[in-house]
Every structure is written in C-alpha cells, then in structure tokens.
Interface confidence: low
C-alpha cells in the first residue's frame, strides 16, 4: 500500500512540477525592469525565453518576439533548449509512469515490468527537473553576473556598456515558478525511484519441504515467511542513481510612444 | 516595418568632429532601444551607443565614453551621433541599429533592424 501511495504521490507530483516548467517557459516574466518608480511615467518592461513586453502606467501592454537577423544569443538558445529537453523528458516520463501504476491494470503485466518502467520514469523526472533547474540557473547567472550585457569580456563594469542613468534589474516570476517546478520534478522522480524498491518482490527462492507427521500430514514452509502464492525468480531492484547539474548565465528596452523614433 | 536611413559620415582630420543621423520611419512604436555600431575592416562589429527611446538612458563603449554623444530628436524621428576628438582608430562603417528587444543589446544578433551604414574615415 505504501509503494502505491509513494509512486501515486510521486507521479502527482511530477506532474504538477512539470506543468510549472511548461509555465515558466512559456511565461514572459523571465526578467524585470523598472526604468521609472513614478507614478505618472511609469514603464515596466519584462522579457522572457520567447518575447519582451513592456506596460505602461495606463496599463497597456505590448509584447513583440524576439526577431532578430543573425540569431539569438547562444546563451538564450542554451537555456530555451534546457527547459524544452526538460519537457520532452518530463512529458515522456508522464506517459510511461501512467502504465507503470500499481493502480492501473494492463493485461498481464507483470510486477517486475512496472517496476523498471516507474525506475525509467522517476529518472527522466529527475533529469527534466535538474535540466529545468539549470535553465533557470543560467538565465538568472547571466542577470547577475552580467546584468546588462553578454559580452562582459569586451569592455567593463555593466557587462561593457556605460551607462548614464541607473536601472534596476529583478529576478521575474517565471524564474521563480521554474525553480520551484524543477524541485518537484526532480522530488517526484526520486520518489517513483523509491517506488520502484518496493514494486518488485524480494527473490525468495524457497521450495516448499512435506514432512510428514504420524497421522496427519503438514506443509512446512521453513524460515517463517508469509505464505505466498509463488515462487520463483523475482527481479530484485537496482539501486537508484542520481546525478547532479550545474550551469550558469542581459539587456532591457523600451517602448517609444507614437511620437518617440 | 522599420527604415533606416544614416547620413554624416565622411572623411576628417584627427581631432576633429563629425554628426551622423539616423532617420527612423515606418512602425516605431515597438522599438526600444536605438543605437550606433561600427565595423572597422576586418573586425567585428561593436557598439558604440545607445539610447533608450523612452528616456535618458544612454550607454557608451569605454572606448568613445566623454568623446562622443548620443541623442534624439522625437520630433524629428532621428537618432544623432556627436563624434568629437576623433581619433584615426574610429575609422569605420557605422550602422544605426534598432531594436525591440530587452536583453543582449551589447550582441548584434539581439537588434531587429538595421541601415545600410555609412563611412568615417579619420586621417591622421
């Protein structure tokens, strides 16, 4: 029962976390800028993986991609790619966990069976929450480290350019979502791999010994384990590997009125 | 879509002073950052300023920093360059760049529009 529980609540998890990475990803909130505080010129601009958006006090919003002549910055590229593999996976390991419940019947498929397809499954969680998490990790990096600018190496302070009046750059929600979604991923597929010890009997290779008593005759089952209704070769579970990833690493615009250039 | 047009560029004598315009038309109201590049021959091509459409913001390459100014005329929809106390090492094509985008504006690949370039040629 308590395998059951472990993997349900393993694979209810995963989901929620990979629900979130496909939020952050889409989500426009990567970054924040707040240009101006007051009141009456105020300009918040946001951009994320895909397009940058600005809102104006009036509460008029306008979003446009992220169209460019001679291709994205290797960096932007990374970490779209990061969390697009971190949902393929994630997306994959759904599909298999859900035939790989305790709780679903699938013809005669057979213990052991479940028990390497929720192992397969709790893997690609914890690989699609560690490559989420990286994802957001680089993209965060690169706001602190170079706060402005890619090139950081080419010139000085604000990642090279100098700058005449101060900004303020924030950590948007999406980073925030994404690191919270890849914690439950990479949660709910340690927990399927949890799971998995338990789905796959211990190997008993017993043989059942008849000892006949005057009189009467009894099966002895020797060792004082619980009657089961089989025996056999039983696949014992393999110990669950985990790996860790690290990674790490921009500029900000604005809207110009009708009247700006 | 966004046209640009450069114009100012030509040859002069170290220390001395050039302005170059850019004439923005066409759909504006996006564009968030403008900017001027230059590609010396056989180099890449870098920054040298920008200014924020919506404000005072201006950026300069440590380079051109105290040297050279950037400015706007909304009025107008052109974007200036002052160059003073040239140097023969600001030879090169300048291009005026614009962009929508928010990040990587230091990258060539984050500008969305771009004009044809013109020539700064300083002699010493």
């Known amino acids: 029962m308590a395998v059951t529980a472990c993997q349900g609540l393993g694979f209810v998890v995963s989901l929620i976390g990979i629900a979130g990475i496909i939020a952050a990803t889409c989500m426009d909130q990567w970054s924040t800028q707040d240009l101006y505080n007051n009141p009456v010129t105020a300009v918040f601009n946001y951009q994320g993986l895909w397009r940058s958006c600005v809102r104006e006090s009036s509460g008029f919003t306008e979003c446009r991609g992220y169209f460019t002549l001679l291709g994205l910055p290797a960096m932007l590229q990374a970490v779209r790619a990061l969390m697009i593999v971190g949902i393929v996976l994630g997306a994959i390991g759904l599909l298999v966990s859900i035939f790989a419940l305790k709780c679903i019947r699938i013809g005669s498929m057979e213990d052991s069976a479940k028990a390497n397809m929720t192992l397969t499954s709790g893997i690609m969680f914890i690989v699609s929450g560690l490559c989420a998490i990286a994802g957001v990790s680089v993209f965060a990096n690169m706001l602190v480290t170079n706060f402005w600018m890619s090139t950081a190496n080419m010139y000085t302070g604000m990642g090279g350019m100098v700058q005449t009046v101060q900004t303020r750059y924030t950590f948007g929600a999406a980073l925030f979502v994404g690191w919270v979604a890849g914690g439950l991923t990479l949660i709910g597929g340690v927990m399927m791999c949890i799971a998995c010890r338990g789905l796959a009997p211990e190997e008993t290779n017993y043989k059942a010994v008849s000892y006949h008593a005057s009189g009467h005759s009894v099966a002895y089952k020797p060792g004082g384990f619980k009657a089961s209704t089989g025996f056999g070769s039983n696949t014992k579970n393999k110990k669950i590997y985990d790996g860790g990833a690290r990674t790490e690493d921009e500029v900000q615009s604005y809207p110009s009125k009708h009247d700006y250039v | 879509e966004v046209q640009l047009v450069e114009s100012g560029g030509g040859s002069v004598q170290a220390g001395g002073s050039l302005r170059l315009s850019c004439a923005v038309s066409g759909y504006t109201y996006n564009l968030k950052y403008m900017g001027w590049f230059r590609q010396a021959p056989g180099k890449e091509r870098e920054p040298v300023a920008f200014?924020?459409?919506?404000?005072?913001?201006?950026y300069y390459a440590p380079s051109v920093k105290d040297r050279f100014t950037i400015s706007q005329d909304n009025a107008k929809n052109t974007v200036y360059l002052q160059m003073n106390s040239l140097k023969p090492d600001d030879t090169a094509m300048y291009y005026c760049?614009?962009?929508?985008?928010?990040?990587?504006?230091?990258?060539?690949?984050?500008?969305?529009?771009w004009g044809q370039g013109t020539q700064v040629t300083v002699s010493s």
């Open positions: 760049a614009a962009t929508t985008a928010l990040l990587f504006l230091a990258q060539t690949s984050s500008w969305n529009y």
């Open positions: 200014i924020y459409l919506g404000g005072d913001n201006q």
